[in-house]
């Protein structure tokens, strides 16, 4: 029997110390913030070029328009992340050509194609949540009792709205039993 530590919940993706949830349902920007908060996460705030490249790849691979935690709702033209930090100079390069264009009060930012676009915040889109990965230290007793006998996590998109996150959230730690022949 081999015990493995999983730093992220089921259906979340680990990257450089953080866990990311790519939603399978669509919500407007404000509801996306709520969805992330309800699972102890945040609508994604991008901190490095590596993280941006990783997330852009996820979004473009799935060919989905996806909300990030960036808007200019507080002050037109001043883009700010949901953690209160401003959009820093080096991240402005990620806007698609001609964006942000604020056509028709487009105040929220999305992953679109190979870059970012501003769009109307009330539109329903996919979203990405981010939270710190759990520590895998045994001293902290973070291993939980074995999970129910479900060989695989539920299929992507099987839950509606927030349910898909809640299901993924239920078991953050899991003892995997490998049978060696």
């Amino acid at each position: 029997t081999e015990r493995l530590c999983h730093p992220c919940p089921w259906e979340w993706t680990f990257f450089q110390g953080n866990c990311y949830f790519m939603s399978n349902s669509q919500r407007n920007w404000h509801d996306s913030i709520t969805a992330c908060k309800e699972v102890g996460a945040q609508l994604v705030v991008i901190k490095s070029a590596e993280e941006q490249n990783f997330l852009q790849l996820q979004s473009s691979r799935s060919n989905r328009f996806t909300w990030m935690g960036l808007s200019d709702l507080n002050q037109e033209g001043t883009w700010q992340w949901v953690d209160g930090s401003p959009l820093l100079p080096s991240f402005k390069q990620y806007w698609n050509r001609g964006e942000p264009n604020n056509v028709g009060e487009e105040d929220c930012a999305e992953f679109s194609g190979n870059g970012w676009n501003d769009d109307k915040c009330n539109l329903a889109k996919f979203w990405i949540c981010k939270k710190s990965a759990a520590s895998c230290s045994r001293d902290e007793e973070q291993f939980l009792s074995p999970a129910p006998a479900t060989p695989n996590p539920p299929p992507a998109g099987s839950g509606g709205g927030l349910n898909d996150i809640f299901e993924a959230q239920k078991i953050e730690w899991h003892e995997h039993h490998h049978h060696h022949h």
């Epitope: 450089q16 110390g17 953080n18 705030v45 901190k47 490095s48 070029a49 993280e51 001043t78 992340w81 953690d83 209160g84 930090s85 401003p86 820093l88 100079p89 080096s90 402005k92 390069q93 710190s132």
Partner: antibody
Framework: QVTLRESGPALVKPTQTLTLTCTFS??????????VSWIRQPPGKALEWLAL???????YYSTSLKTRLTISKDTSKNQVVLTMTNMDPVDTATYYC???????????WGQGTMVTVSS | QSVLTQPPSVSGAPGQRVTISCTGS?????????VHWYQQLPGTAPKLLIY???NRPSGVPDRFSGSKSGTSASLAITGLQAEDEADYYC???????????FGGGTKLTVLG
């Protein structure tokens, strides 16, 4: 070759306003990705970031000094100006301007200008 | 009190290896923001030594290297030379302060 040079008064009186000019060459502040920042260093102490202006004319200020600082640029003259109001003796420092290219590293610095605040 | 914590001083003999630590928090280094290192020789302006955690600008000897893990970063100098005697500063961005932040600086003394 990228060069930056700071200029301004060596001595200012308490409560006065300090105006510093950074004149640069070797790059343009109208080029995407370019920014210029002001950083100071009191004698024998650590570096402290003050303000930054980017090619887009977006301005960023130190939270603790925000109410006292104004940064602006004159792209045609290749200059960035910092004004700091209500000067106090604790503001005595060497003031540097520095270029910040992508990834938020200050990759080129001026030689610095020493400003003493005293009556 | 600086947001990024560095040891005030380190020392080593010529040829030795020294490391300088830079400890931050979840709002700066731990958040994923890049770390940069500067060398300030006595009486001169700082000079970029390491950018984006571990990259050297052209002209910086490969005796200097940087790394980052979790909420901290470190600068290593191997084959210590007399001309390495200087102050070294780490720098990152802090989302709580909405600003760029520096460490308190570390004075490197080359013995002998």
């Amino acid at each position: 070759q990228v060069t930056l040079r700071e200029s301004g008064p060596a001595l200012v009186k308490p409560t006065q306003t300090l105006t510093l000019t950074c004149t640069f060459s070797g790059f343009s502040l109208s080029t995407s990705g370019m920014s210029v920042s002001w950083i100071r260093q009191p004698p024998g102490k650590a570096l402290e970031w003050l303000a930054l202006i980017d090619w887009d004319d977006d301005k960023y200020y130190s939270t603790s000094l925000k109410t006292r600082l104004t940064i602006s640029k004159d792209t045609s003259k290749n200059q960035v100006v910092l004004t700091m109001t209500n000067m106090d003796p604790v503001d005595t420092a060497t003031y540097y301007c520095a270029r910040m290219a992508l990834r938020h590293a200050f990759d080129a610095w001026g030689q610095g200008t020493m400003v003493t605040v005293s009556s | 009190q600086s947001v990024l914590t560095q040891p005030p001083s380190v020392s080593g003999a010529p040829g030795q290896r020294v490391t300088i630590s830079c400890t931050g928090s979840s709002s700066n280094i731990g958040a994923g923001y890049d770390v940069h290192w500067y060398q300030q020789l006595p009486g001169t302006a700082p000079k970029l030594l390491i950018y984006v955690n571990s990259n050297r600008p052209s002209g910086v000897p490969d005796r200097f290297s940087g790394s980052k893990s979790g909420t901290s970063a470190s600068l290593a100098i191997t084959g210590l030379q007399a001309e390495d005697e200087a102050d070294y500063y780490c720098q990152s961005y802090d989302s709580s302060l909405s600003g760029w932040v520096f460490g308190g600086g570390t004075k490197l003394t080359v013995l002998g």
